[in-house]
């Protein structure tokens, strides 16, 4: 019957396992008159046969490694051998079996690595080949370190990328390798096919000898540079050296300063390029980078520290044009009137900023001069000779000389003589009762007005009232602002109220003056008042520990890898359930109990990085309130995209016949990340047979020129295959085709007679 093994002539594809002796026919084609026989052409390799009656079969075992696809054509012929149907393509796909073992290209590898090399940066590749199909487990290779000799404290210093065979240092290796202690290591590496996952996998081993070399790429000692240097600039201050000659050095200013006064030359010598000012910036931290000829970093940057040493280049400055203090008329000798605090921009706690205070003039000198003294180093003014009388002299002006070791500055102080402070503030109410507020009451809200009065001289420190909460608010959730004209106190919320930690607070206020009370007068119960704050519960949403959570992983991490985690707490203490929102690519899942985030699909940096999703924390039980935070997953690039043409190049043509060899320029790109220097592709012809007619030459890292080698081309389309290699780790290669048509031209354009094929080239060379 027609069906799986027989039927009419039509394009078909058959899959046959290699290595199996023929056990049945492939297909029986049925002839429709006038067809009487069949003919087989194409890649038969004398294996595939069609009998005249249409029976297609193969006569011996196939070998995928010899040919993975046999492209055959079957035609139906009439009695005269003329094709009456077809030819139609018949594709035989040879399915792979694991009949080849992986083999290392070398039985021994040798390499060297510098101490402190970046962990994970490959310094050597081992490479094995397996003739089996790399698209199946049969040809998927898995590299492993079998043993490291010597092994110190059971710590692996080396690691291997099990897919690429790239050998690099582990974090411990980067930190601990020391050629003085151990200059060489030996690794035994195995490679298995079947992705290393099967008991039936084939394997091979190789030996790797590694020499550890000294790393002179080290951060120099911190540098001290005196500010305001008058020496000719630039001045060499330190140096860095890469391990090999030819490195290109640069400095990176992480702080993005408007003025960056340092430079580095191509020897690695670092200079300060202009005088520094410690008062502008007292220390600099920047980085020295060594790059290769292509602008790729050779190693991690070195941190350079420059401390700017102070010189005494700043005079003292007064706190304000006039500093005002008050003194009560009956104050006793030695009482503090106030402290004058001058400033000096030079370095703190050094002689350059150490200040001396001296009174140089008192006006008026009534009833005598020298009524005040100032502590030489502290700047505290004291009453020196006698009590003062407001009715005699209500105001004194002092000129005070403030000096450091080189500079002198005059500051002015006004001392107002005021009434004695013999009245205490008295609250108009001793108990302001109860106040009930919800815990989500806004910060800044005024919740209570309090009032005390003081009978002392108005608008002086004796009558001014300051309110303090002295009990019941250890968290500092409340504050009191005073109106200086009315002495009214406004109780405001400074921090969020919290039912869970303080449902009831018994608050005690104290009212006091900035001026001290006269001897014998004390604050009493009249200067105290209380009130009770009752906070009511509001069910609050869970709170995330961060607004944005961020994690960084390589784009090729295995499915199921933990890529980050989030945490939230519920104010009411309820359990929390985590979920994801906006995972548009279906890459992630979250453990709803722990908040750990895992990958569930292959990640792809080229699809967009960082990948942003929202995490939702929801109360379990209660009113199921939820809150949202961001999770940003930064994907680090791996070289997983082969180069391709940057645009569509159909429509290229040369006018036929060529009068002289011609050329055209094309551009390549790929989707991987190209830090620092952009792509660095290399170009070659895709097959040897093209070399008689064409040549390809590189212009730069992204562009190349395709040139004709002669002028003897037929008037037709040529498809030129070009191999583009990205030089990555591992290197990836793309084979692209440039269709170039040689055609008769009219006024510089391709001429096509009417009714000719479509797809006329439109770009002439």
């Amino acid at each position: 019957q027609e069906g799986k093994f027989s039927g009419p002539l039509k394009p078909m594809t058959f899959s046959i396992y290699e290595g199996q002796e023929p056990s049945q026919i492939i297909f029986q084609f049925k002839a429709n008159p006038p067809a009487v026989t069949f003919e087989l052409t194409g890649e038969t390799d004398n294996i595939f046969v069609i009998e005249r009656e249409g029976l297609l079969y193969y006569n011996r075992a196939l070998d995928r490694e010899t040919r993975s696809t046999h492209n055959l054509q079957v035609a139906a012929l009439d009695a005269n051998g003329i094709i009456v149907e077809g030819p139609v393509p018949i594709t035989i796909k040879v399915k792979d079996i694991n009949d080849n073992r992986p083999t290392f290209l070398q039985s021994k590898y040798e390499g060297s690595v510098r101490q402190n090399s970046r962990p994970g940066k490959p310094f050597l590749y081992v490479n094995a080949t397996d003739l089996d199909d790399p698209a199946t487990p049969n040809g998927q290779l898995y590299y492993q370190i079998v043993i490291q000799l010597p092994m110190i404290n059971n710590v692996m210093y080396f690691q291997i990328n099990n897919k690429t065979g790239a050998i690099s240092l582990t974090r411990e290796g980067s930190q601990e390798l020391n050629p003085a202690k151990n200059p060489s290591y030996n690794l035994v590496i195995s490679v298995k096919d079947m992705g290393g996952q099967s008991e039936n996998s084939f394997s091979d081993t190789t030996s790797v000898d590694i020499i550890v070399t000294e790393n002179i790429w080290k951060a120099p000692k911190p540098v001290e540079m005196v500010e305001n240097s008058t020496d000719p600039h630039p001045i060499k201050i330190t140096q860095v050296r890469w391990n090999d000659p030819g490195a290109q050095y640069s400095l990176v200013d992480k702080e993005k300063l408007p003025r960056f006064p340092f430079s580095i030359d191509q020897e690695g010598d670092i200079y300060v390029t202009q005088p520094l000012d410690r008062e502008e910036k007292d220390a600099y931290v920047f980085y020295a980078v060594a790059k290769d000829e292509y602008g790729k970093p050779l190693s991690y940057p070195l941190e350079i520290h420059v401390k700017v040493k102070d010189i005494n280049d700043n005079p003292p400055t007064c706190p304000s044009p006039v500093t005002v203090f008050e003194v009560q008329e009956n104050e006793r000798l030695g009482n503090s009137i106030g402290t004058l605090t001058a400033h000096d921009r030079d370095e703190e706690n050094t002689a350059n900023s150490f200040l001396n205070y001296r009174i140089v003039e008192q006006t008026p000198k009534l009833p005598m001069d020298g009524l005040f003294l100032i502590q030489t180093y502290a700047g505290m003014l004291q009453l020196a000779k006698q009590s003062l009388k407001k009715q005699d002299t209500p105001q004194y002006n002092l000129t005070i000389e403030v000096s450091d070791k080189d500079f002198k500055t005059l500051c002015f102080v006004q001392i107002n003589v005021i009434d004695i402070n013999d009245q205490i503030p008295i609250f108009e109410k001793s108990d302001y009762g109860n106040l009930t507020l919800a815990e989500d009451t806004n910060i800044g809200s005024t919740i209570l007005t309090i009032q005390a009065t003081d009978a002392d001289e108005p608008f002086t420190g004796s009558s001014k009232i300051l309110y303090h909460i002295i009990k019941g608010d250890s968290e500092g959730r409340l504050g009191v602002d005073t109106d200086p004209h009315t002495n009214t106190g406004y109780v405001i919320i400074k921090k969020p109220l919290d039912f869970e930690t303080a449902a009831v607070s018994n608050i005690v206020f104290k009212a006091e003056n900035p001026e001290p009370l006269v001897f014998g007068v004390k604050y009493n119960a009249s200067s105290f008042a209380k009130f009770t704050l009752i906070v009511t519960d509001v069910n609050e949403a869970p709170q995330f520990s961060q607004h944005v959570f961020q994690a960084k992983v390589s784009e090729d991490v295995a499915i199921g890898t933990k890529v980050g985690n989030v945490t939230a707490k519920d104010p009411e203490g309820l359990d929390i359930s985590y979920s994801l929102r906006g995972d548009t690519r279906g890459w992630l899942k979250i453990d709803h109990v722990t908040g750990e985030i895992f990958s569930v699909a292959p990640l792809d940096r080229e699809a967009g990085s960082p990948y942003r999703v929202q995490v939702v924390a929801t109360e379990v039980g209660g009113s199921s309130l939820s809150s949202v935070s961001e999770f940003h997953l930064i994907l680090m690039d791996v070289n997983d995209n082969p180069p391709r043409l940057a645009k569509d190049y159909t429509g290229l043509f040369f006018c036929h016949p060529l009068s002289a060899p011609g050329s055209l320029i094309f551009e390549a790109t790929d989707d991987d990340q190209h830090l620092f220097r952009g792509p660095h592709f290399t170009f070659s012809l895709g097959s040897g047979s093209l070399q008689n007619d064409w040549e390809v030459s590189k212009i730069n890292g992204t562009h190349a020129r395709l040139s004709t080698r002669h002028t003897e081309f037929e008037e037709r389309e040529y498809v030129v295959l070009i191999r583009i290699n990205d030089g990555g780790r591992p290197p990836l290669e793309g084979i692209v085709s440039l269709p170039v048509t040689f055609c008769s031209c009219v006024e510089g354009s391709c001429f096509r007679p009417a009714g000719h094929q479509t797809g006329i080239p439109t770009v002439g060379m």
């Epitope: 008159p33 006038p34 009487v36 009695a79 005269n80």
Partner: antibody, heavy 119, light 112 residues
Amino acid sequence: QVLLQQSDAELVKPGASVKISCKASGYTFTDHAIHWVKQRPEQGLEWIGYIYPEHGTIKYNEKFKGKATLTADKSSSTAYMQLNSLTSEDSAVYFCSRLTNYFYVMEYWGQGTSVTVSS
Amino acid sequence: DIVMTQAAPSVPVTPGESVSISCTSSKSLLRSNGNTYLYWFLQRPGQSPQLLIYRMSNLASGVPDRFSGSGSGTAFTLRISRVEAEDVGVYYCMQHLEYPFTFGSGTKLEIK
């Protein structure tokens, strides 16, 4: 051995018809196509068409459609060609020919039948 | 229709010498199976045509190996080395690639 025996010469008047035969022997008649070829005096060869007795498949050169009619009688292993509305242009020797089984070449030929159209 | 051209109506030759007869086609007779569908026939005076060469270069059974065929997809040559008297007649090329089959106009071999 393979033999193709054609009928004798014919003298016919303009406007008339003639039917010439080609009797096959020495092989299975239905297995092979029979071709007919025309040769005018002192001129080249022209392919008229073929008949495949197994299927009854017939293919004509467009130039001879309406002029020649090909038939076959499997019982007598004979192929026929009838020529209609004869004119002096149809005066020629007509050959039948058989293809080889695999290489599809006219290896076997009849001796030819001369047709003369004259009033 | 494919046009077969035999440019030389006749070629004179001395017995024992070699001679080449050419034929061209208006379309390539090379098919994707690698075969070139070109045949050579000899028609001796008063006889039916006789097959000499099939598929451009293959000698038909019973034909002396003095005859050989060669060519590309569109230009073909029949070569006779050491011509004998019995080789006289008209030589025709014919294409067998597609319908209608077509013959060349013939080249007459004459003995000097």
